[in-house]
Each structure stands twice: as structure tokens, then as C-alpha cells.
Interface confidence: low
């Protein structure tokens, strides 16, 4: 089990590092997006796991971005952000609409809008229960 957890972490790390770099190979990214969306978590240990991924970086030093699957909809009151940015991209994470042609990346206008917890604990619990 420990080996399985280590292997899973390695796969997730590679997925995060390569997120959005190849529009033709998105299966791992979609799977991880789905994990974040379902478990209401972001990143492996912390949401900050995403902050140094180059494809997610904007031009400014503070331009931190995360996949839209990290977005906590219940914490967001800004309807403009929801309607124009988040919902159209999160709608692709449903069971029926899983395909996409580019990485779904959202700016972080306030980091309180993203899930604060990493996914490692939730996934490890899931592994132990199965």
C-alpha cells in the first residue's frame, strides 16, 4: 500500500508538472481534475503545488493560477467570475462531458475561492477503504 501511495504521488506530480503542455494528451489531467472536483481539494499536499507550474503562470509575479477544478463554487459570490469563467469550464467535468482541447485554467482573484486542502489525505483514505 505504501508503494502504491508513492506511485500515485509520482503520477500526480508528473501530471501537475506537465499540465496543459500537450493538448493531445489530456487523460491524466482530466482524471486529476475530476479527483479535485469530486474530493473538493486542490493539489497534492497544498493548492500551492500548482503555483510554480509554468503553463499556469501569467506575466506578473503574483499571477498565480490553478486548474478550474480547484475552484470552490460555494465560496464564490462573484457572479461574473462564476458565469463567465468558472462554470463554463467546470461544466466539462461532469460525467457526460469529459473531453477538452486545452487545459482549463483559472486565475485566482482571491485564493479563498480555491479549495484549501490538498488531495493527498482524501486519496489515501480512499485507498485504505478500497
Amino acid at each position: 500500500r505504501a508503494q502504491l501511495e508513492r506511485s500515485l504521488r509520482d503520477v500526480v506530480e508528473k501530471t501537475i508538472q506537465k499540465y496543459g503542455t500537450n493538448p493531445e494528451e489530456t487523460a491524466a489531467e482530466e482524471s486529476w481534475d475530476y479527483v479535485q472536483f469530486q474530493l473538493r481539494c486542490c493539489g497534492w499536499h497544498y493548492p500551492q503545488d500548482w503555483f510554480q507550474v509554468l503553463i499556469l503562470r501569467g506575466n506578473g509575479s503574483e499571477a498565480h493560477r490553478v486548474p478550474c477544478s480547484c475552484y470552490n463554487l460555494s465560496a464564490t459570490n462573484d457572479s461574473t467570475i462564476l458565469d463567465k469563467v468558472i462554470l463554463p469550464q467546470l461544466s466539462r467535468l461532469g460525467h457526460l462531458a469529459r473531453s477538452r482541447h486545452s487545459a482549463d485554467i483559472c486565475a485566482v482573484p482571491a485564493e479563498s475561492h480555491i479549495y484549501r486542502e490538498g488531495c493527498a489525505q482524501g486519496l489515501q483514505k480512499w485507498l485504505h477503504n478500497n
Epitope: Q48, E62, R116
Partner: antibody, heavy 120, light 110 residues
Framework: EVQLVESGGGLVQPGGSLRLSCAAS????????MGWVRQAPGKGLEWVSV???????YYATWAKGRFTISRDNSKNTLYLQMNSLRAEDTATYYC??????????????WGQGTLVTVSS | DVVMTQSPSTLSASVGDRVTITCQAS??????LAWYQQKPGKAPKFLIY???NLPFGVPSRFKGSGSGTEFTLTISSLQPDDFATYYC????????????FGGGTKVEIK
């Protein structure tokens, strides 16, 4: 512009106290772990303390009980309260923003530093 | 607490040289290591995180490697701007959360 600016350094007598401030601009301090790192004249870097985004504090063994890290999110400012100061605390104190990556921490943004001199 | 030992403490080199700095941890820290560059009178500048990852804007001539207890920073072709002091930092966010810096390596002009 994203930056950190320290203040509050100066000359203090042994046994005295000092409070350092670090004003953040261009980003919200409350969303980050923040830390203090010091450097004695002509010496290397020495980790002092960190306060995480939830407010939990961590200290180097030698700093426990004498130094207190805190933050005022409404002022977007980090503090380091230093008590019972000794000559060996003489150093430039840097405020730094901490990022985390897969359980690993590092400091991606640093202030210019403020010099603390402890001498009679 | 983990102790970080850097070597050499001083290194004389010329522009264009390949330079290697090593950092040894007193206990296993996996890949939880960062490197910084510091010039006199300036704040440290963040160079490498998670042992081998370059942040946005750091030139590709800088390369970090290693895991466990042995780590290396390599500058493939030293540039005039690279003469500085380099520090490694253990960065394991465990239950104790104590960070530690190496003693530094000064890269000076030969």
C-alpha cells in the same frame, strides 16, 4: 508591484526588545505562509520563524520563548517581536514569502532586510 | 534538527567554467531542497525548488540534482552575473517544520 518592505531595525541594548515589521504590497499576506530569516554580518543565512496561512507558528529552537511571529491581515503586515536580545542576535533580518510544493517549502519573495544591532 | 553542510565554502572560477556546489543533509530529506543566490548587500534570490525545479525566469544553465542526503547545484557555463554566494536550504514541511540553511558557497573570480 509585488514586494516586501521591512522596518523597525536599529540599535538596542542587550536584554532589550524590538519589533520588526514587514509590509507586503501587490499580494494578500493572508493567503501565504510568511517567514523571517536572518544573516549576521559576514555570515550565512539562518532560519528564524514561519507563520502559516492558518496562523500556526513555527520557530528555530534557539528562537522559542524569545521571538514571536505574528501578522495583521487587515494591514497586510508581518511582525517579529524580539525580546531578551543578545549580542549574537545582531543581524540583518529578512522577511520572506514562503511557497510550498509537494511538502517542500522555499522562499520565492524577499524583502530588502532591516539591520538589528545589539550592543551596549 | 537537520543540519546542512555545503562544500566548498569558496570556489574560484572563470567565466565559461562549469561549476559544481554540493550540499549534504544530516538526514534523509527526499527532494525537499531549495537553492538561493545572494550578492553582497542584497537579499537572497530564489534559484531552484524541490531539488531540481527551476522557477520562472531562472536561466537554464542552473541545474539542481540529488535526493535523500546528497544534492548538487551545477552552473554549466559561468556568466559574469553568477559570481555570488549560493545557499542550499532543507525544506521539509514535516511536523516539526524547521528549515535549515547550508553555510554558503562563495563563487569568486579566479
Amino acid at each position: 508591484e509585488v514586494q516586501l518592505v521591512e522596518s523597525g531595525g536599529g540599535l538596542v541594548q542587550p536584554g532589550g526588545s524590538l519589533r520588526l515589521s514587514c509590509a507586503a504590497s501587490g499580494f494578500s499576506l493572508s493567503n501565504y505562509n510568511m517567514g523571517w530569516v536572518r544573516q549576521a554580518p559576514g555570515k550565512g543565512l539562518e532560519w528564524v520563524s514561519v507563520i502559516d496561512a492558518s496562523g500556526t507558528t513555527y520557530y528555530a529552537t534557539w528562537a522559542k520563548g524569545r521571538f514571536t511571529i505574528s501578522r495583521d491581515n487587515s494591514k497586510n503586515t508581518l511582525y517579529l517581536q524580539m525580546n531578551s536580545l543578545r549580542a549574537e542576535d545582531t543581524a540583518t533580518y529578512y522577511c520572506a514569502r514562503e511557497l510550498l510544493y509537494f511538502g517542500s517549502s522555499y522562499y520565492d519573495l524577499w524583502g530588502q532586510g532591516t539591520l538589528v544591532t545589539v550592543s551596549s | 534538527d537537520v543540519v546542512m553542510t555545503q562544500s566548498p565554502s569558496t570556489l574560484s572560477a572563470s567565466v565559461g567554467d562549469r561549476v559544481t556546489i554540493t550540499c549534504q543533509a544530516s538526514q534523509n530529506i527526499d527532494s525537499n531542497l531549495a537553492w538561493y543566490q545572494q550578492k553582497p548587500g542584497k537579499a537572497p534570490k530564489f534559484l531552484i525548488y524541490y531539488a531540481s525545479n527551476l522557477p520562472f525566469g531562472v536561466p537554464s544553465r542552473f541545474k539542481g540534482s540529488g535526493s535523500g542526503t546528497e544534492f548538487t547545484l551545477t552552473i554549466s557555463s559561468l556568466q559574469p552575473d553568477d559570481f555570488a554566494t549560493y545557499y542550499c536550504q532543507s525544506a521539509d514541511v514535516g511536523s516539526t517544520y524547521v528549515a535549515a540553511f547550508g553555510g554558503g558557497t562563495k563563487v569568486e573570480i579566479k
